[in-house]
Interface confidence: low
């Protein structure tokens, strides 16, 4: 099929970075500035993406590949190929229609993006809360209350390391 196609289509041998120019008897012409073709046999070149405003250029456009954008500091990418930039928030916050808002009690966000998520419910796994959650951090679940009952063996955590020459307070 490919051989048949190439016999029928004089444009099929135009390589990536060029286009088959119908205005010049279908010879291969290089893509004009600020355009590209990533595959051979193209009848037109695509316009390069321009990383403007909140977008910044991560990879320049070439004759064979489109530019790639990311977001300026204070923003992060959303969507395929970074089609949108969304404002960062602080840890412990989420972005709403009214801007960055603190996570509600019982929820946390440990990133500058995304939504606040509920703390882990330790009791669902039969465990107890070892470290309370905050707006920025999830709770830390510890051993189950049964594991801590008298007579049950428990692993003693290692003593914190101290610098030599310092006695315990």
């Amino acid at each position: 099929f490919e051989r048949t196609r190439s016999l029928q289509d004089p444009c099929s041998n135009c390589p990536a970075g060029t286009f088959c120019d119908n205005n010049r008897n279908q010879i291969c012409s290089p893509c004009p500035p600020n355009s590209f073709s990533s595959a051979g046999g193209q009848r037109t070149c695509d316009i390069c993406r321009q990383c403007k405003g909140v977008f910044r250029t991560r990879k320049e456009c070439s004759s064979t590949s489109n530019a790639e954008c990311d977001c300026t500091p204070g923003f992060h990418c959303l969507g395929a190929g970074c089609s949108m930039c969304e404002q960062d928030c602080k840890q412990g916050q989420e972005l709403t229609k009214k801007g960055c808002k603190d996570c509600c009690f019982g929820t946390f966000n440990d990133q500058k993006r995304g939504i606040c998520r509920p703390w882990t419910n330790c009791s669902l796994d039969g465990k107890s809360v070892l470290v309370n959650g905050t707006k920025e951090r999830d709770v830390v679940c510890g051993p189950s209350p049964a594991d801590l009952s008298p007579g049950a063996s428990s692993v003693t955590p290692p003593a914190p390391a101290r610098e030599p020459g310092h006695s315990p307070q």
Epitope: G53, G74, C85, E86, Q87, D88, K97, K98, G99
Partner: nanobody, 121 residues
Framework: EVQLLESGGGEVQPGGSLRLSCAAS????????MGWYRQAPGKRREFVAA???????VYAESVKGRFTISRDNAKNTVYLQMSSLRAEDTAVYYC???????????????WGQGTLVTVKP
Amino acid sequence: EVQLLESGGGEVQPGGSLRLSCAASGFSFSINAMGWYRQAPGKRREFVAAIYSGSSTVYAESVKGRFTISRDNAKNTVYLQMSSLRAEDTAVYYCGLLKGNRVVSPSVAYWGQGTLVTVKP
């Protein structure tokens, strides 16, 4: 009704400074992103700077380090402080209300009428 009223334009010598203001009304100012654009004679309108509801800012490469965008939510006003002005900064400067805080190449929902800045010796 959304209204954007620019002021502060004028004639200034190269190296000089100007402060443009854009007084906004008719919408909830503090939760919206605002931008400044400019159009030089015979050229297309181009992005200059934007400021988002959280006060994050973005600048065109050509004005970085010389222009500063700021906002006063209490006064519903956005400002463009321009310094080290050059002849190529001569243009009509437009205030724009951007579409939300999620931005795809800042798209403008509403424009002001513009204020002329002329930089010449």
